[in-house]
């Protein structure tokens, strides 16, 4: 019985002349992957990754298809003709064959740059807004604490008791209050043996992810 599922990068877009990583991942099965085939829209072969024989790249694509990362494939020097469906076929033992689909849209450089011109300031503004909100919340929290401590101070002033000030200590461990936790530029180990353009491409890809994750702000607030 085939219990596994293929997870793919789904619908992706990339710039003409640029590169893109096609990734499929087989999960929910203990089956052994013996071979992965990569095919193009018209079902013509792009590459094969055999567990024992390594990679076979279709000769016509040898200069612009790079094996990896992992069982994935990196398409370089993209043209408009590269737009379309891509299929990964996993041969496994004992399950049999699994198949995944990815749709790649190659955008004209001008279109991509045009959308980027609007996107970057927008993302920048959003990030700035989040930073401002973070700071505002910190200020409110600090002021509230100060007010509270002043009240306590005035009530206990007759007793001449000194405040420990512990509540105002900022935990230094994970990150300072209000800091926006950024994702790592590239997951550890992913570029271990992968070097050169592919790896640079990976870093670019994950830098985009980390840029998008700027919105996750962590606050250290009192509980109780």
């Amino acid at each position: 019985m085939m219990t596994g599922t293929i997870e793919t990068t789904g619908n992706i877009s990339a710039k003409k002349g640029g590169s893109v990583i096609l990734q499929c991942h087989l999960s929910s099965t203990m089956a052994q992957v013996t071979q992965v085939n990569w095919e193009q829209h018209d079902h013509s072969l792009l590459a094969i990754r055999n567990a024992e024989l390594g990679w076979h790249i279709y000769p016509a694509f040898k200069d612009r298809v790079a094996p990896g990362p992992g069982l994935g494939l990196t398409l370089q020097s993209l043209t408009m003709n590269d737009t379309g469906e891509y299929f990964c076929t996993y041969h496994t033992y004992p399950d049999g064959t699994y198949r995944g689909r990815i749709f790649l849209e190659v955008l004209e450089s001008s279109v991509a740059e045009h959308s980027a011109r609007f996107q970057i300031p927008l993302l920048g503004a959003m990030a700035m807004m989040l930073v401002v909100i973070c700071i505002a919340v910190i200020v409110v929290v600090v002021l509230a604490r100060k007010k509270k401590s002043l009240r306590i101070h005035s009530v206990e002033s007759g007793l001449q008791r000194k405040s420990t000030g512990q509540e105002e200590q900022i935990p230094s461990a994970p990150s300072p209050p209000g800091s926006c936790v950024q994702a790592e530029a590239a997951p550890a180990g992913l570029c271990g043996e992968q070097q050169g353009d592919d790896c640079a491409e990976l870093h670019d890809y994950f830098n985009v992810l980390s840029y998008r994750s700027l919105g996750s702000c962590s606050f250290f607030t009192e509980t109780g």
Epitope: T34, I48, N50, A51, H56, Y58, P59, K62, T97
Partner: antibody, heavy 119, light 107 residues
Amino acid sequence: QVQLVQSGAEVKKPGASVKVSCKASGYTFTRYSMYWVRQAPGQGLEWIAFIDAYSGGSTYAQKFQGKATLTVDTSISTAYMELSRLRSDDTAVYYCARGGDYGWYLGVWGQGTLVTVSS
Amino acid sequence: DIQMTQSPSSLSASVGDRVTITCRPSENIYTYLSWYQQKPGKAPKLLIYNAKSLPSGVPSRFSGSGSGTDFTLTISSLQPEDFATYYCQHHYGNPLTFGQGTKVEIK
């Protein structure tokens, strides 16, 4: 048209080494892998190894690991196979063959090189 | 290792006959099988790849079929130049292995 021309016959003594060459023409050398197969007199075909002419990486049959060494010189579109520690049972015709477009099969073959190991 | 068992090891046939050679791998190789023809004193020549695909220049009387662990090479109408030895080969793992060969002789 695609052509693979191999070096001439060799006679070697046991324990010696031999280097067979395979000159390719009629296609872009670095786009294909080069395979080596041998055939002992009156016997069937036996795969030895292949080399990716683009990266220079080789894959060997376990039996020939440490026995055969594959190299390429892309500047002259030539593949080489060196066999070391020759024994009499290494006497065979050695073929180079260009890999196929769609996988690890052998699309075009050289004419073969007879290597005779005899004391 | 994947063992390739070819049958028959030899056969006698006449010009015009339909000839069938089978190849049985010891395990599932999907459609990763090729067929070669070798004439005495000559290098082998590719006839079929990926179980059923014909390279350009190979006559259409040659055809391949099968998948998994059962494959067939068929010569629909045997010609004088077809008398030779035929080998199957899997291309699904290391080592790549060949069948022991089938010699097609004139009856």
